[in-house]
């Protein structure tokens, strides 16, 4: 806490500029008007203030806006954002995607901090749903964001937002999350033609039921083994040898290398040996 002291004669700040870096903490407190700071926040980032000086500037804004900063100030916080606590951020009402992007940029390349996590939560909750533009932005900065949501939270994501999802955004999702996302993806991509549809739906297939896998097997999709290995075991087990052969196409030979791993192992054990022999891979049921 900086003591309240009178501003020395001639030191009253008329604008936020580089001359302020030579001010001591108490001089900043006494000589910089909080309202001036708020209107010229965009200048702060261009000035090499010390962390201690930034603390003073934050303190001034806190006094001016005890109920939380307005978005006009938040948008221009820049590095001062790193000084905010999650409790500060909880008071904010951030509605502009541009503001969100500006603050995420400050933290770019770092792990998601508690401040950033709180900011994202406040923003998404304020929007009322995880729309496509928001998801696009969040996954660009944090590819793991989608898989950090619970299955219940994912259930509230509109199918239209699924267009923003890239394969790498689903890397850390578990089967229960894919169970929720797959039907949304199926709905989102339903008007695409066969080959384009498969390219889009492929990353979500860990949530696909047996009947959808059977349907795909009729479309010459040539699913790769990496995708096949991520399918639900209970969805793979009822597939016939002929259906798996059609589903995998030229990749069917890869079954041999995966014969000891689920779901391939369990599927092999469910098949008649005569049927397995038709593949010519030496698979033993």
């Amino acid at each position: 806490e900086v003591e309240k002291t009178a501003c020395p004669s001639g030191k009253k700040a008329r604008e936020i500029d580089e001359s302020l870096i030579f001010y001591k903490k108490w001089e900043l407190e006494a000589c910089v008007d909080a309202a001036l700071l708020a209107t010229q926040m965009d200048r702060v980032n261009a000035i090499p203030f010390t962390y201690e000086q930034l603390d003073v500037l934050k303190h001034k804004l806190d006094e001016l806006y005890p109920q939380g900063y307005p978005e006009s100030v938040i948008q221009h916080l820049g590095y001062l954002f790193l000084k905010m606590s999650p409790e500060d951020i909880r008071k904010w009402n951030v509605t502009s995607l541009e503001t969100l992007k500006a603050l995420l940029e400050v933290n770019k390349g770092h792990e998601m901090s508690p401040q950033v996590a709180t900011l994202i939560d406040r923003f998404v909750k304020g929007r009322g749903q995880l729309d496509k533009d928001t998801l696009d932005t969040l996954t660009a900065f944090y590819p793991g964001y989608l898989c950090s949501l619970s299955p219940e939270e994912l259930s509230s994501v509109p199918p239209s937002s699924i267009w923003a999802v890239r394969p790498q955004d689903l890397d850390t999702c578990d089967p229960r999350q894919l169970d929720v996302l797959y039907p949304k993806a199926r709905l989102a991509f339903q008007n695409m033609n066969g080959s384009e549809y498969f390219v889009k739906i492929q990353s979500f297939l860990g949530g696909a039921p047996t009947e959808d896998l059977k349907a795909l097997s009729q479309q010459n999709v040539s699913m790769d083994l990496a995708t096949f290995m991520k399918l639900r075991t209970d969805a793979v087990l009822p597939l016939t040898v002929a259906e798996v052969q059609k589903l995998l196409g030229p990749h069917v030979e890869g079954l041999k290398a995966e014969e000891r791993h689920r779901p391939v192992r369990d599927w092999i054990l469910r098949q008649r040996q005569d049927d397995l022999d038709t593949l010519g891979l030496g698979l033993q049921g």
Epitope: R90, L149, S150, R176
Partner: nanobody, 123 residues
Amino acid sequence: EVQLAESGGGSVQAGGSLTLSCTASEYVTHLGWFRQAPGKEREGVAIESFRIGYTYYADSVKGRFTISHDNAKNTLYLQMNSLKPEDTAIYYCAARQDRSGASMVNRDSYNYWGKGTQVTVSS
């Protein structure tokens, strides 16, 4: 360390109403109520996600229980209407700061618990 302060609960006739409240000492990602009836598992009843603005309700309470919250006070309210004898249980406020993707009703993912408040509904 998140502290949870519960209030509300008590005894009521079937068809009556009660309101529970729970205040968290700091920001949490999920806050809500679980309940445990004698000889039964602890189950999620109504849980608010502060991450995405989604509220979970157990099927058995949908249309009867409603969550509301006061952001400024970090307080969550559970309005319980049309109470039934089978709603009798100890109600626990629970909170977590969780971004693992764990289910909202997975009680093992909640690391902060209130002491519990008894709700008794007689027929």
